[in-house]
């Protein structure tokens, strides 16, 4: 019977004197007065079965133990690892010159597991054995032992099993632990290939190569190879598999795609989440599926996100002169989540009677710098008729418009042309400035051409540069513009609006907002 | 099997000479120490010495020294001891004990029967 | 001269318990200690040697420990022809005996 010990995986024992419980029952010659196995308490207070001999007194000493046969396993080249202790012979009273500090080792192969009879004559030897300088100190029961432990090799091997013998030639000695073991390569996966468990070869310089096979759910890239080398390492790792699509590797595995993950090619990369606005249902998805309304463009990448239709354009502003529209807007609050967003124009010519019956503008109307797929927010549309009522549609279109149209992406503005817009402002003045706002005040057009409306105040962040502007409308000459920033640099423009349309902005003013309230009156020039 | 045989019970008066045999059979004489310890009536046991059996050398006790010689013979495979002007304190049990070396330790493995020597007038 | 004591000098125990003797020495004798068994009219038996191995056919319910200068011996189970008297023996470069500990029936 056997207990379990914990040896490296890349030793196979093929017999381990510490872990047979009772006798270990091995041949000595002579019968008596020989090696005797006693018993002695490890570290643990268990018994283990050792075999000692101390015949330092008499000069000429040839005691034998021999082991039970050891069957080979297939192995060619086995290692025998004694751990031993020995006595100085200098601590032992009167037995100098008859005293040895060393045994011999010897093997016998066979295919005979039954030899009753040691034969001297027919094991070769394998080294002589000697303590070696250095020894780890172990715990026996209650006392320190010198435990020397040595390693042999013996190979290449052929019959079916062999025999180790001890001689000793007048030592005091005891063997603690005799364990036989081969080395092989243990079954390993590498590069997602799987080596089978190998035994290393005849010689301690051999390599033995051998072919991997790829694990389930992955395919060859390269013909997967390694080494088995004498030392039971696997060395040199050629070639590999790679994760089928929908499948990652794992711990040496390739593991399906958890649900909301995906892999589109056979790659060495992970599973990788699924894009936003996109889901999967099952494991080992290649691709995942938009969420209601959003789409993938034709040339998007499955590791892109899934994007929607951008959302109206803001702030459509016209201005009229004669018979030229300029249009001006500001992007949409939603892109849709894409960056290749761009803007159509669409121009209806529409009866003064009925502003319903509008039909297009036709090919005369010139647009700049153009009609459609315009990257600016602005439009100036020319060669419109006189007195004629115009609707103009900005749509706001990305890359996945065309699979969800709808009116929604577009914003209009009607005008007339040919009627007279009023002049612009010529003084815009900061009444007060806080933290937080700016009170505006401004004369009305020179020429107002009309009944003033309204008037618009735009205005924006200095260092936006008027990418991003608000609108405020007003029937007074005044406002309060709310919710600014403090300390920052704002620029304003007033424009009036009559019946006809709306007039030109006035000169830009830029005020700087304040960290304490205080009152400053403008002059028209900039005030910070 | 392995036994040390000793002999029978001496009288002896005080001043005289009384010499212990101890036959050893079943294993090489040579190749073991012999010890030699002495129990005196109801009390405990005390060594006396030993002798190498291969080279004849005796080593004794603090105590024993003087009148107490360990000798051999070795082709009859045998050990003596020799007590020599006996005094009554002599009066006691003497043992002969293989002495047994080991990695582990040493200890006397195998003994005699114990010869009584009695020392009175 | 290293002197060895034993105690108790006398441990009456009943067949089956368990019984525990000691042994100090006066200084360190490392694991260089043994114990013999010796029973009325009868030569001294070696049991334990090396502080705490077994001498051949020496059953497994004595066991022994210690080293320096504190030794046990322990019956793990009286057995009617274990009562007797138990010596502890050192061997430096001179041996010496305890001076004994009995152990009779309760």
């Known amino acids: 019977v056997t207990g379990s010990r914990v040896y490296p995986a890349n030793e196979v024992t093929l017999l381990d004197s510490r872990s047979v419980q009772g006798e270990l029952g091995w041949i000595a010659s002579p019968l008596e007065g020989g090696w005797e196995e006693v018993s002695i308490m490890d570290e643990k207070n268990t018994p283990i079965r050792t075999y000692q001999v101390c015949n330092v007194m008499e000069a000429s000493q040839n005691n034998w133990l021999r082991t039970d046969w050891i069957t080979r396993e297939g192995a060619q080249r086995v290692y025998i690892e004694i751990k031993f202790t020995l006595r100085d012979c200098n601590s032992l009273p009167g037995v100098m010159g008859t005293c040895k500090e060393t045994f011999n080792l010897y093997y016998y192969e066979s295919d005979n597991d039954k030899e009753r009879f040691i034969r001297e004559s027919q094991f070769g030897k394998i080294d002589t054995i000697a303590a070696d300088e250095s020894f780890t100190q172990v715990d026996i029961g209650d006392r320190i032992m010198k435990l020397n432990t040595e390693i042999r090799d013996v190979g290449p091997l052929s019959k079916k099993g062999f025999y180790l013998a001890f001689q000793d030639v007048g030592a005091c000695i005891a063997l603690v632990s005799v364990r036989v073991f081969y080395k092989k390569c243990p079954l390993t996966v590498r590069n997602l290939a799987q080596f089978p468990d190998t035994i290393t070869g005849a010689d301690t310089s051999s390599l033995v190569e051998v072919r991997g096979s790829c694990v389930n759910n992955s395919e060859e890239k390269d013909v997967p190879k390694m080494y088995c080398g004498a030392d039971g390492e696997w060395l040199v790792p050629i070639g590999n598999c790679l994760c089928n699509a929908g499948h990652e590797e794992q711990n040496g595995e390739c593991q399906a795609c958890k649900i909301g993950y995906y892999k589109a090619l056979s790659t060495d990369a992970s599973c990788a989440k699924c894009p936003p606005h996109s889901y999967s249902v099952w494991e080992g998805a290649t691709s995942c599926t938009c969420d209601r309304g959003f789409f993938r463009a034709d040339n998007d990448a499955a590791s892109m996100p899934c994007t929607r239709p951008p959302s109206a354009p803001l702030n459509l502003i016209s201005n009229v002169n004669e018979t030229s529209v300029n249009l001006e807007w500001s992007s949409p609050q939603n892109t849709g989540g894409r960056q290749d967003i761009s803007y159509n124009v669409v121009c209806k010519k529409c009866g003064a009677g009925d502003p319903s019956k509008c039909r297009p503008c036709g090919s005369g109307v010139h647009y700049t710098p153009q009609q459609n797929g315009l990257k600016t927010t602005r439009v100036s549309i020319t060669d419109l008729l006189a007195h004629t009522n115009y609707t103009f549609e900005i749509w706001a279109v990305n890359g996945v418009s065309k699979y969800n149209p709808s009116p929604d992406q577009s914003v209009s503005v009607t005008v007339t042309t040919n009627q007279a817009a009023p002049s612009s402002i010529a003084l815009v003045q900061a009444k007060e400035v806080t933290r937080y706002s700016v009170a505006l005040a401004w004369l009305e057009p020179d020429r107002p051409n009309g009944v003033i409306l309204e008037y618009e105040v735009k205005y924006y962040e200095k260092d936006q540069n008027e990418r991003s502007y608000r609108i405020v409308r007003t029937a007074a000459r005044n406002t309060d513009i709310k919710g600014l920033n403090p300390l920052t640099s704002y620029v304003f423009h007033v424009r009036a609006r009559t019946a006809a349309g709306y007039g030109d902005f006035s000169e830009p003013l830029e005020v700087t907002t304040n960290t304490v309230p205080s009152r400053i009156i403008g002059d028209g020039a900039n005030s910070t | 099997q392995v036994q040390l045989l000793q002999s029978g019970a001496e009288v002896k008066k005080p001043g005289a000479s009384v010499k212990v045999p101890c036959k050893a059979s079943?294993?090489?004489?040579?190749?073991?120490?012999m010890s030699w310890v002495r129990q005196a009536p109801g009390q405990g046991l005390e060594w006396m010495g030993w002798?190498?059996?291969?080279?004849?050398?005796?080593t004794y006790a603090q105590g024993f020294t003087g009148r107490f010689v360990f000798s051999l013979d070795t082709s009859v495979s045998t050990a003596y001891l020799q007590i020599s002007s006996l005094k009554a304190e002599d009066t006691a049990v003497y043992y002969c004990a293989r002495v047994r070396f080991t990695v582990y330790g040493d200890g006397m493995d195998v003994w005699g029967q114990g010869t009584l020597v009695t020392v009175s007038s | 001269e290293i002197v060895l004591t034993q105690s108790p000098a006398t441990l009456s125990v009943s067949p089956g318990e368990r019984a525990t003797l000691s042994c100090r020495a006066s200084?360190?004798?490392?694991?260089?200690l043994a114990w013999y068994q010796q029973k009325p009219g009868q030569a001294p038996r070696l049991l334990i040697y090396?502080?705490?191995t077994w001498a051949t056919g020496i059953p497994d319910r004595f066991s022994a420990s210690g080293s320096g200068t504190d030794f046990t011996l322990t019956i793990s189970r009286v057995e009617p022809e274990d009562f007797a008297v138990y010596y502890c023996q050192q061997y430096g470069p001179s041996w010496t005996f305890g001076q004994g500990t009995k152990v009779e029936i309760k």
């Open positions: 079943g294993y090489t004489f040579t190749s073991r120490a």
């Open positions: 200084q360190s004798v490392s694991s260089n």
């Open positions: 090396g502080a705490s």
């Open positions: 002798i190498n059996t291969n080279t004849g050398n005796p």
